[in-house]
Interface confidence: medium
């Protein structure tokens, strides 16, 4: 029998449309600087080759691994050395080292301008003239900006994008239809990107065990009626899917994700009562729907946890017989009973339980040693509860922008060495937790907030890893995945920091500020706030309030002036002088 061709297998499983989309995403995530047209050419060649192999699996090169085929194709790009420098060295390596080399050169911060929707008329014309190219360009633009984007999910968002243009390009007021819809989609895409980046970081930095533990907790909360073996099965499959996508194996990843959706839908009875609607949808929507499905109700027959994990005389025997399985059942049982807890908290509790058993099972009287273990959970539970309460109160008092600024001050004082753009980006995202989570009912606040914070702080870790400047960030990012947030929360102001020299250029503004969209205007103001703090880290809240108030008034005044540039040139230095005096 002819050797099974991997590329033919994936082409047949996925179908031509999805195959092409995924190959485009893969190439765009590896070669982020290449123009769209170059990628289209590579995708075309790859698809023709796959088609040939599907027709005749014994054809030349059809038996080669996907990594070999993809790598060979990437290494044919003419401008590799000029455009990518070191990345070209990867081409001198053999698989699997070559693919690993490509992965290490993925750039999390490629510096492309944010994706915006230009003139609706222009967009609609482009969409209607060549739909395939229009959607391909979207795939490419998102993938190159987000080199770890979850590829099958990006196919789903591209389908949504198509739906938006199909609807809005028929509308009388195209802009009124397109703007809110593309903006809402953009937000979803950004959150999706950050979530997957967190998953990839979990796998790459902390290994399968960390990712599996996170998934056991999450799926046990979602599917509390499923038994432990069922949850474990789903976790095993999910780990494989995300490992593949994070490793650049997008065809395998999408194929396995489809298989997983099929399995879930064929076994609804042993998983959840909430899946029927999702399972009636076509593939992309089905997978997305399953990923977002609401949690099932708790079964009525849940016994108190203490019976099995504290009072049972054989706790140490059960633990020592198979530590991972016993701890897995503990995490499963605890998580399904506590949908209101964050996954991060559940993992901290499991860690505490493990540490207690390690210590107690080595003593002469283990039961009396671990008998109070659940009491030791109290402070671990109260810490995030209090954090959410205090910060949501602050958010309600200040609003999103004010809350972002409070976080900006807090984090700049903690981590003054971190670059201003990174501090602004991360603090703005941290501030969005208020809008996203503080409006939710009490029972959903903690899991929403803490798990979102984990994703945002991962962005800080990823950006910092590229150019490390702070030992504190390195320590919080690398010591423990579940304790990242408490680690950052516990940091006080950095007393070792030497204030930055004052640079008037940093505080020089021009008339172009006036034409910026509101969000970008805010970023400019927030960058000034960070720079101010780096210059005067001991500034009080009152002083900062005064200076920022003056700054806001200055911008408003000059943007309303007849001669804007003249106003900025004249009033700017006065503002700087007043600010220096106020902070003296």
């Amino acid at each position: 029998e002819a050797q099974q061709s991997e590329i033919a297998h994936r082409y047949n499983d996925l179908g031509e449309e999805h195959f092409k989309g995924l190959v485009l995403v893969a190439f765009s995530q590896y070669l982020q600087q290449c123009p769209f047209e170059d990628h289209v050419k590579l995708v075309k060649e790859m698809t023709e080759f796959a088609k040939g192999c599907a027709a005749d699996q014994s054809g030349a090169d059809c038996g080669k691994s996907l990594h070999t085929l993809f790598g060979d194709k990437l290494c044919t790009v003419a401008s590799l050395r000029e455009k990518y420098g070191e990345l070209a060295d990867c081409c001198e390596k053999q698989e699997p080292e070559r693919n690993e080399c490509f992965l290490t050169h993925k750039d999390d911060n490629p510096g492309f301008p944010p994706l915006v929707t230009p003139d609706p008329e222009v967009m609609c014309t482009a969409f209607q003239e060549n739909e395939q190219q229009f959607l391909g360009k979207y795939l490419y633009e998102v993938a190159r900006r987000h080199p770890y984007f979850y590829a099958p999910e990006l196919l789903y968002y591209t389908q949504q994008y198509k739906g938006v243009f199909t609807e809005c390009c028929q509308a009388a007021d195209k802009a009124a239809c397109l703007t809110p819809k593309t903006e809402a989609l953009r937000e979803k895409v950004l959150v999706s990107s950050a979530r997957e980046r967190f998953k990839c970081a979990s796998l790459q930095k902390f290994g399968d065990r960390a990712f599996k533990a996170w998934s056991v907790a999450r799926l046990s909360q979602k599917f509390p009626k499923a038994d432990f073996a069922e949850v474990s099965k789903l976790v095993t499959d999910l780990t494989k899917v995300h490992k593949e996508c994070c490793h650049g194996d997008l065809l395998e990843c999408a194929d396995d994700r489809a298989d997983m959706a099929k399995y879930i839908c064929e076994n609804q009875d042993s998983i959840s009562t909430k899946l029927k609607e999702c399972c009636d949808k076509p593939l992309l929507e089905k997978s997305q729907c399953l990923a977002e499905v609401e949690r099932d109700e708790l079964p009525g027959d849940l016994t108190p946890l203490a019976a099995d994990f504290v009072e049972d005389k054989e706790v140490c025997k059960n633990y020592q017989e198979a530590k991972d399985v016993f701890l897995g059942t503990f995490l499963y049982e605890y998580s399904r009973r506590h949908p209101e807890y964050s996954v991060s908290l559940l993992l901290r509790l499991a860690k505490e339980y493990e540490a207690t058993l390690e210590k107690c099972c080595a003593t002469a009287d283990p039961p009396s040693c671990y008998g109070k273990v659940f009491d030791e959970f109290k402070p671990l539970v109260e810490e995030p509860q209090n954090l959410v309460k205090v910060n949501c109160e602050l958010f309600e008092k200040l609003g999103e922008y004010g809350f972002q600024n409070a976080l900006l001050v807090r984090y700049t004082k903690k981590l003054p060495q971190v670059s201003t753009p990174t501090l602004v980006e991360v603090s703005r995202k941290l501030g969005k937790v208020g809008t996203k989570c503080c409006t939710k009912p009490e029972t959903e606040r903690m899991s929403c907030a803490e798990d979102y914070l984990a994703v945002v702080l991962n962005r800080l870790c990823v950006l910092h890893e590229k150019t490390p400047v702070s030992d504190r960030v390195t320590k919080c990012c690398s010591e423990s995945l579940v304790n990242r947030r408490p680690c950052f929360s516990a940091l006080a102001g950095d007393e070792t920091y030497v204030p930055k020299e004052f640079n008037a250029e940093t505080f020089t503004f021009h008339a172009d500020l006036c034409t910026l969209p509101d969000a970008e205007k805010q970023v400019k103001k927030q960058s000034a706030l960070v720079e101010l703090l780096k210059h005067k880290p001991k500034a009080t809240e009152e002083q900062l309030k005064t200076v920022m108030g003056d700054f806001g008034a200055f911008v408003d005044k000059c943007c309303a002036a007849e001669n804007k540039e003249g106003c900025f040139a004249e009033e700017g230095p006065k503002l700087v002088a007043a600010a220096q005096a106020a902070l003296a």
Epitope: D227, F228, A229, E230, S232, K233, T236, Y263, N267, D269, S270, P299, L302, D308, N318, V325, F326, T329, E333
Partner: nanobody, 119 residues
Framework: EVQLLESGGGLVQPGGSLRLSCAAS????????MLWVRQAPGKGLEWVSV????????YYADSVKGRFTISRDNSKNTLYLQMNSLRAEDTAVYYC????????????WGQGTLVTVSS
């Protein structure tokens, strides 16, 4: 009613191998996770291995990891345990059991089959 019938036990020398089988009836085998448990003379029950209804994932007690392999054939309603590199401490009555709806305990088990490892 649920019936589980184990077979394949016997006397074997240390380092030897045995393959246990468990024929299941009275419930939908292909939607049930299954496990093997054992009881050494004068000792309590110890779980050995678990297998999901689909055949993966599988779990093993630390004491048998790398030596024992659990598998199943859903078309034959049969569960297996391949035991290699047997040791004296593996001597026990081996039972197959139906996995419960929650904890790492078990609902039903069969009559058992005795495995004796001795030179």
């Amino acid at each position: 009613e649920v019936q589980l019938l184990e077979s394949g036990g016997g006397l074997v020398q240390p380092g030897g191998s045995l393959r246990l089988s468990c024929a299941a009836s009275g419930f939908t085998f292909d939607t049930s996770s299954m496990l093997w448990v054992r009881q050494a003379p004068g000792k309590g029950l110890e779980w050995v291995s678990v297998i999901h209804q689909s055949g993966t994932p599988t779990y093993y007690a630390d004491s048998v990891k790398g030596r024992f392999t659990i598998s199943r054939d859903n078309s034959k309603n049969t569960l297996y345990l391949q035991m290699n590199s047997l040791r004296a401490e593996d001597t026990a009555v081996y039972y197959c059991a139906k996995f419960p709806s929650s904890r790492m305990k078990f609902d039903y088990w069969g009559q058992g089959t005795l495995v004796t490892v001795s030179s």
